[in-house]
C-alpha cells in the first residue's frame, strides 16, 4: 500500500532572467528512493538515479542544474518556461509517486513565492 | 552527423594493461550526454563496462571496479578505457557508445581485442 | 544486479509473420527498458527506448510495449532486412545490463 505523500514548493513565480529551484519531498513512507525524474509537461527534463547520479537532458544543459538534494535549479527564466513541472519520485517497494509544481515567470519584479501544498 | 571511432592495439599479453580511445566528431563531449564502453566478448551477450560525464565524473560497473578507468582529453573530443590485469576472459569487441539517459543511442565501429601471451 | 532473461534464444519466422520477442527482468525496472538491433558482424543499433518510444529512423513496423518486469518487442510484418540479433537493456541503476540476446532468422 502505497502511504506517502510528496510535499512541493506549490505555485511558485519567478522573474525573467532569474533562477529558481524546483523541490519535492517525500515523505510519510518508508519506501526507498531509487530514482526521481523532472519533467515539463512532456519533456524530461533531468533524472537523479540513486546508482548513477544526476543525467540532464542535453537539450536544457545551459540552463538546467542539479540540485540542491533531489531538487533541480532552473537559470536564465524566460516566459517560455512558465507552466507545469512534476516530479516523479520512483520507489521501492511502493511504486511511483509525482508532485506537481506550476511556475510562472513574471516579466515584473514583484514576483512572490506561493503557499506549499500536498499531494497525497 | 556523430560519429565515434575506437582506436588501440589488438593484442594485449595477459596481465598487462588494456587501453582504447574513442575519437569524437560532430559533436563535443563536453556538450552533454555520456560517454560509455561496452563490449561483447565472442558468441557471448553485450556487457556494459562504464562511462563518463561531459564533466568528468566517472560511474563503473561493479564487476570491473578496481580494474577500470575511463578519462577523457576535452581538447582532442575523445575519451579513453583503460584495464588493468587482463585475462583470457577480456577478449572481446569493445565498442564506445553515447549514452542519453542510460541508453545508447550512437555506436562506435567496435574494435577486436585479443589478449593472449 | 538486475537479471535480464529473453526468450526465445532464437526463432525463425516468414516474411510478413508477426514477431514477438519477449524480456524479463529480475527486479521492477518501471518503463526503463531499451531494445536493440544487431545485424551479423554490425554495430548493434537502437530501436526503442523507454519502453515503447522508436527511436529516430526506426520502420514504424517495429513496437514496444510492457512495464515492470515484463516487457515485449513487436515486428508487426517481418521483412528480409529484419535478420538480426536483438538485445534488450534496462536503463535503470548500475550495472546496466543487456539480455543474452535473440536471434531471428528467415524460414
Known amino acids: 500500500m502505497m502511504t506517502g505523500t510528496i510535499e512541493t514548493t506549490g505555485n511558485i513565480s519567478a522573474e525573467k532572467g532569474g533562477s529558481i529551484i524546483l523541490q519535492c519531498h517525500l515523505s510519510s513512507t518508508t519506501a526507498q528512493v531509487t530514482q526521481v525524474n523532472w519533467e515539463q509537461q512532456d519533456q524530461l527534463l533531468a533524472i537523479c538515479n540513486a546508482d548513477l547520479g544526476w543525467h540532464i537532458s542535453p537539450s536544457f544543459k545551459d540552463r538546467v542544474a542539479p540540485g540542491p538534494g533531489l531538487g533541480l535549479t532552473l537559470q536564465s527564466l524566460t516566459v517560455n518556461d512558465t507552466g507545469e513541472y512534476f516530479c516523479i519520485y520512483h520507489t521501492y517497494p511502493d511504486g511511483t509517486y509525482t508532485g506537481r509544481i506550476f511556475l510562472e515567470v513574471l516579466e515584473s519584479s514583484v514576483a512572490e513565492h506561493g503557499a506549499r501544498f500536498q499531494i497525497p | 552527423e556523430v560519429q565515434l571511432q575506437e582506436s588501440g592495439p589488438g593484442l594485449v599479453k595477459p596481465s598487462e594493461t588494456l587501453s582504447l580511445t574513442c575519437a569524437a566528431s560532430?559533436?563535443?563531449?563536453?556538450?552533454?550526454?555520456?560517454w560509455h564502453w561496452i563490449r561483447q566478448p565472442p558468441g557471448k551477450k553485450l556487457e556494459w563496462m562504464g562511462f563518463?560525464?561531459?564533466?568528468?565524473?566517472?560511474v563503473y560497473n561493479p564487476s570491473l571496479k578496481g580494474r577500470i578507468t575511463i578519462s577523457h582529453d576535452t581538447s582532442k573530443n575523445q575519451f579513453s578505457l583503460k584495464l588493468s590485469s587482463v585475462t583470457a576472459a577480456d577478449t572481446a569487441v569493445y565498442f564506445c557508445?553515447?549514452?542519453?539517459?542510460?541508453?545508447?543511442?550512437?555506436w562506435g565501429q567496435g574494435t577486436t581485442v585479443t589478449v593472449s601471451s | 544486479d538486475i537479471q535480464m532473461t529473453q526468450s526465445p534464444s532464437s526463432l525463425s519466422a516468414s516474411v510478413g509473420d508477426r514477431v514477438t520477442i519477449t524480456c524479463r527482468t529480475s527486479e521492477n525496472i518501471f518503463s526503463y527498458l531499451a531494445w536493440y538491433q544487431q545485424k551479423p558482424g554490425k554495430v548493434p543499433k537502437l530501436l526503442i527506448y523507454n519502453t515503447k518510444t522508436l527511436a529516430e529512423g526506426v520502420p514504424s513496423r517495429f513496437s514496444g510495449s510492457g512495464s515492470g518486469t515484463d516487457f515485449t518487442l513487436t515486428i508487426s510484418s517481418l521483412q528480409p532486412e529484419d535478420v538480426a540479433t536483438y538485445y534488450c537493456q534496462h536503463h535503470y541503476g548500475n550495472p546496466l545490463t543487456f539480455g543474452q540476446g535473440t536471434k531471428l532468422e528467415i524460414k
Open positions: 563518463i560525464r561531459d564533466s568528468g565524473s566517472t
Open positions: 560532430g559533436y563535443s563531449i563536453t556538450s552533454g550526454y555520456d
Open positions: 557508445a553515447r549514452g542519453l539517459f542510460w541508453y545508447f543511442d550512437v
